[in-house]
Amino acid sequence: FKETFQPVLCNKEVPVSSREGYCGPCPNNWICHRNNCYQFFNEEKTWNQSQASCLSQNSSLLKIYSKEEQDFLKLVKSYHWMGLVQIPANGSWQWEDGSSLSYNQLTLVEIPKGSCAVYGSSFKAYTEDCANLNTYICMKRAV
């Protein structure tokens, strides 16, 4: 079910760790970039199922924390579940770790219906029904 990184980046050159010094360690077949590990999963799941899948691999759904440090993500195509959810009580958006979305992290497009979000490309996220099926991106710190 794993998707290789090259097609996700639409045949653009993959940023490799050797150019930036050592990066890692990451689980086998995960991508290391700026000391974070990423994996793109091709299997379509609901948001909750995707979250559970990441947790089972000691990771969490994608969090955007820095456009500069996660620059390769601007090349991602298609739509993938990320770790951003709307809090029903006040309508605000926060990451899985409880931190609030800051609008310099990414553009949140709230035109579609939903209280979960998919990552598109160029640091744009789109609201979506959490029960919909999507591919997903897991992320963890390299230790």
Partner: antibody
């Protein structure tokens, strides 16, 4: 008041290209998606693609990939669509539209006629 | 990718109530918003209903939108139909991100 002013009707020859424009006013052009829609008589509305002028990001309906190219000029708040290798199947009215959380705004449409 | 299916044409009497349907082929109709557009011959479409049931300023309250989960359809209801309501009506929802999907349209004839 939001307005989308499109360029005039076009009569073009098969095999050629055409570039039509959509000038936006009354809102922040860079931070809104601009979509393009094709309408042929009796054929309903077909989504061609969108452009996000803020960063030039685009997405296309697979059917129009290679047929349409979307661009935008932030300085003039104008979106453009180029259609290439035109055939009679491309004869249609083309709309630019701004889809928002609220009402959708439509340009007046550009009639493109492909004829030798 | 799902399809939105609308009846090709509907006829109704002046002053009556008519319901126009928009059926989603796969997936839940409620999982994304539905917008409705009216298009008179030779004109651009205009928004009649957005986000399932909201009416833009200037649209008569004779027009209302709803979601019918049992038939997996969106409905546009027009009460007290007037001659100026004779037009084509299109429903629209979203597939991925903000990519719109349109129904084929319904031609409403007022008798």
């Amino acid at each position: 008041e939001v307005q989308l002013q499109q360029s005039g009707a076009e009569l073009v020859k098969p095999g050629s290209s055409v570039k039509i424009s959509c000038k936006a006013s009354g809102y922040t052009f860079a931070n809104n998606f601009m979509h393009w829609i094709k309408q042929q008589p009796g054929n309903g509305l077909e989504w061609i693609g969108w452009i996000y002028p803020g960063d030039g990001d685009t997405e296309y309906n697979q059917k129009f990939s290679g047929k349409a190219t979307l661009t935008a000029d932030k300085s003039s708040s104008t979106a453009y669509m180029q259609l290439n290798s035109l055939t009679s199947e491309d004869s249609a009215v083309y709309f630019c539209i701004r889809l928002t959380e609220g009402t959708t705004y439509w340009g007046q449409g550009v009639m493109v006629t492909v004829s030798s | 990718q799902f399809v939105l299916t609308q009846p090709n044409s509907v006829s109704t009497n002046l002053g009556s109530t008519v319901k126009l349907s928009c059926k989603r082929s796969t997936g839940n109709i409620g999982s994304n918003y539905v917008n409705w557009y009216q298009q008179h011959e030779g004109r651009s479409p205009t928004t009649m209903i957005y986000r399932d049931d909201k009416r833009p300023d200037g649209v008569p309250d004779r027009f209302s939108g709803s979601i019918d989960g049992s038939s997996n359809s969106a409905l546009l209801t027009i009460n007290n139909v007037q001659t100026e309501d004779e037009a084509d009506y299109f429903c629209q929802s979203y597939s991925r991100g903000v990519s719109p999907v349109f129904g084929g349209g319904t031609k409403l004839t007022v008798l």
